[in-house]
């Protein structure tokens, strides 16, 4: 297993619709053809997997049908979008990149993007 540098923004504020997008960029030492991207969430010192996708270079990322993540790839960049976020989902979202094929296997883990999610204010009651 060889180390690889992964860069991601330090902080992002999700939209009022609970959508957060950020780029995860990796410094590929070679010509990988198969890449696996995993998003981990760290909160209260607990780490959980949010979503993961394996893709062939030049192809779209394919997450599971029920995943809250979508993404596109361009060269050594992966543009990740996480949807359906609520205030309770605020936390540190860490991008993990694995170059699966061809060997050697490379692993890179970013420092994480602190995603803040603000629940929208409830609309005031209106009289008609």
């Amino acid at each position: 297993c060889k180390a690889m540098h992964v860069a991601q923004p330090a902080v992002v504020l999700a939209s009022s619709r609970g959508i957060a997008s950020f780029v995860c960029e990796y410094a590929s030492p070679g010509k990988a053809t198969e890449v696996r991207v995993t998003v981990l969430r760290q909160a209260d010192s607990q780490v959980t997997e949010v979503c993961a996708a394996t893709y062939m270079m030049g192809n779209e990322l394919t997450f599971l049908d029920d995943s809250i993540c979508t993404g596109t790839s361009s060269g050594n960049q992966v543009n990740l979008t996480i949807q359906g976020l609520r205030a309770m989902d605020t936390g540190l979202y860490i991008c993990k990149v694995e170059l699966m094929y061809p060997p050697p296997y490379y692993l890179g883990i970013g420092n994480g993007t602190q995603i803040y999610v603000i629940d929208p204010e409830p609309c005031p009651d209106s009289d008609f």
Epitope: V11, D44, I118
Partner: antibody, heavy 116, light 108 residues
């Protein structure tokens, strides 16, 4: 090294607007947020809101909602805070700061005086 | 909004003594998203602690933070002359983010 340099002191009349700038250097501007905090003379700190320089999304203190606008110009690594319909109790030192989990780097502060 | 109440309002101590500052929240602060700042007259605040217990870059280890939920503490193990200042807590787990009213640590 990380630096945040704010615009100079302002004197405004009640009802006017003020726009304070905060120029960042020494780091990747779009990777961080910019938080705005104010401090009235002899008083404590008051959080005004923040902007994610990555995507321009904002989160404002409810008491200032409708009067405050925070923006960024990523081409110049500058953040702006505009406060409208100024009142005498808006007289304060206004600080910008680089935000992730707390403000680790601060601007020098901009004194805004509202007086007729 | 979450109201943060700091106590005591003023703490009179001598250099070398231990200072214990309290910050109590009106409701639970999610994920211990609480920070502590130090401010001296005429200066911008300085971040000491984030995440309730993590020291910011360059902060001496005599400063430590602890607590979770609604009760948080900033401890200065041995006061140095430069530590006499006003200290603020801030929660950033629930919008609007809020500050406590501050605790002044003065020389006895």
């Amino acid at each position: 090294q990380v630096q945040l340099v704010q615009s100079g002191a302002e004197v405004k009349k009640p009802g006017a607007s003020v726009k304070v700038s905060c120029k960042a250097s020494g780091y990747t501007f779009t990777s961080y947020g910019i938080s705005w905090v104010r401090q009235a003379p002899g008083q404590g700190l008051e959080w005004m809101g923040w902007i994610s320089a990555y995507n321009g999304n904002t989160n404002y203190a409810q008491k200032l909602q409708g009067r405050v606008t925070m923006t960024t110009d990523t081409s110049t690594s500058t953040a702006y805070m505009e406060l409208r319909s100024l009142r005498s109790d808006d007289t304060a030192v206004y600080y910008c700061g680089r935000w992730v989990r707390g403000v680790e780097y601060w601007g020098q502060g901009t004194l805004v005086t509202v007086s007729s | 909004e979450i109201v943060l109440t700091q106590s005591p309002g003023t703490l009179s101590l001598s250099p070398g003594e231990r200072a214990t500052l309290s910050c109590r929240a009106s409701q639970s602060v999610s994920s211990s998203y609480l920070a502590w700042y130090q401010q001296k007259p005429g200066q911008a605040p300085r971040l000491l602690i984030y995440g309730a217990s993590s020291r910011a870059t360059g902060i001496p280890d005599r400063f430590s933070g602890s607590g979770s939920g609604t009760d948080f503490t900033l401890t200065i193990s041995r006061l140095e002359p430069e530590d006499f200042a006003v200290y603020y807590c801030q929660q950033y787990g629930t919008s609007p983010w809020t500050f406590g009213q501050g605790t002044k640590v003065e020389i006895k």
